[in-house]
């Protein structure tokens, strides 16, 4: 089953994807792909690296970490409700049937509406306007715009991000990793 | 020490081909990628792709995709580009560099460079 | 392929100035830009590779900073030695690209 991972629309998501390769240099070629893993390589490739570098990629896709050490996460620029699906990162190990094979389900959500100002309350202390939605490598931060008048459901809202990012770190080393060698 | 020396100067005729060498010493010529890169008077650098010793693997620019080939002799540590269908566009600076994992693949050792002109 | 976009083209300086010069990407590159310099009738020598790495024997003068599109090269304290072009290049994908160069002039 798939690992599921969130965005919101207009938003940077993040896709983790990791295998350790068996000597420094020795890297595999990995592809990524709209759609869950099929028998031999990607459907519909949105992004393909070889032994060296990145040699095919669409736009808005790109690998925002250490792809030569093994990270191979994928980074998907202002996304739409289009870009909801299953994505494959593939790590193509050579020999017959080697490949590792990972489908991760990304959701992407309605941008939040911003609520028209009213009475401001100073919550900036207990909810900042930027929240890192991942600690690994650079942080992709989501704007959640001025707080002026927060409720309990909206407090409920906030800490279920937060515990979706929480997740989505946790996974890092469990999900989408391989050591290969 | 590292180095790498570049076969001499070529003058060639438009729609004729050139082979420039680059012989290898100083380090194992089959764990580092050898690059060729090229420059125009006055110009920037353009990279012409890589070839691999090790497995003879290479990666080619798609713009010189079909007029170039990049070929390696192990035994003498040599590395060699051959472009053809030459246009006088063609005529630059060509410098071999080797490239490795340690620096991500950035070319850290520069060949001499080898003057091609082109010209009828 | 990805566009190197690097300014200026031309920078005049006198020696101790401190100089920098940016490289911009057409698109996300990550950390993966290397900086090189090219003295006339020369090769080009690696200065800085993965963003801000500097290479093997470089003076600790010449720094480099940014990632995803925006790369910066800086230069502390100009050297007379250091009078030459330089350029940027994305080492993430293939083809491997150059900026156009950037030019220490003599003010």
């Known amino acids: 089953s798939e690992v599921e991972y969130r965005a919101e629309v207009g938003q940077n998501a993040y896709l983790p994807c990791f295998y350790t390769p068996a000597a420094p240099g020795n890297l595999v070629p990995v592809c990524w792909g709209k759609g869950a893993c099929p028998v031999f390589e990607c459907g519909n490739v949105v992004l393909r690296t070889d032994e060296r570098d990145v040699n095919y990629w669409t736009s808005r896709y790109w690998l925002n970490g250490d792809f030569r050490k093994g990270d191979v996460s994928l980074t998907i620029e202002n996304v739409t409700l289009a870009d909801s699906g299953i994505y494959c990162c593939r790590i193509q190990i050579p020999g017959i049937m080697n490949d590792e094979k990972f489908n991760l389900k990304l959701v992407i959500k309605p941008a939040k509406v911003t609520p028209a100002p009213t009475r401001q309350r100073d919550f900036t202390a207990a909810f900042p306007r930027m929240l890192t939605t991942r600690g690994h490598g650079p942080a992709e931060t989501q704007t959640l715009g001025s707080l002026p008048d927060i409720n309990l459901t909206q407090i409920s809202t906030l800490a279920n991000e937060l515990r979706d990012s929480r997740l989505a770190n946790d996974l890092r080393d469990s999900g989408a990793t391989i050591r290969i060698g | 020490q590292v180095q790498l020396v570049q076969s001499g100067a070529e003058v060639k005729k438009p729609g004729a081909s050139v082979k420039v060498s680059c012989k290898a010493s100083?380090?194992?010529?089959?764990?580092?990628?050898m690059d060729w890169v090229r420059q125009a008077p006055g110009q920037g650098l353009e990279w012409l792709g890589y070839?691999?010793?090790?497995?003879?693997?290479?990666s080619y620019n798609q713009k010189f995709k079909g007029r170039v080939t990049m070929t390696t002799d192990k035994s003498t540590s040599t590395a060699y580009m051959e472009l053809r269908s030459l246009r006088s566009d063609d005529t630059a600076v060509y410098y071999c560099?080797?490239?490795?994992?340690?620096?991500?693949?950035?070319?850290?050792?520069w060949g001499q460079g080898t003057t091609v002109t082109v010209s009828s | 392929s990805i566009v190197m976009t690097q300014t200026p083209k031309f920078m005049p300086v006198s020696a101790g100035d401190r100089v920098t010069m940016t490289c911009k990407a057409s698109?996300?590159?990550?950390?993966?830009v290397a900086w090189y310099q090219q003295k006339p009738g020369q090769s080009p020598k690696l200065l800085i590779y993965?963003?801000?790495n500097r290479y093997t024997g470089v003076p600790d003068r010449f720094t480099g900073s940014g990632s995803g599109t925006d790369f910066t090269f800086t230069i502390s304290s100009v050297q007379v030695e250091d009078l030459a072009v330089y350029f940027c290049?994305?080492?993430?994908?293939?083809?491997?690209?150059f900026g156009t160069g950037t030019k220490l002039e003599i003010k």
């Open positions: 290049q994305q080492h993430y994908s293939s083809p491997s690209t």
């Open positions: 100083g380090y194992t010529f089959t764990d580092y990628y």
């Open positions: 070839i691999y010793p090790n497995n003879a693997g290479t």
């Open positions: 560099a080797r490239s490795g994992y340690g620096n991500y693949y950035t070319m850290d050792y």
């Open positions: 698109q996300s590159v990550g950390n993966n």
């Open positions: 993965y963003a801000s």
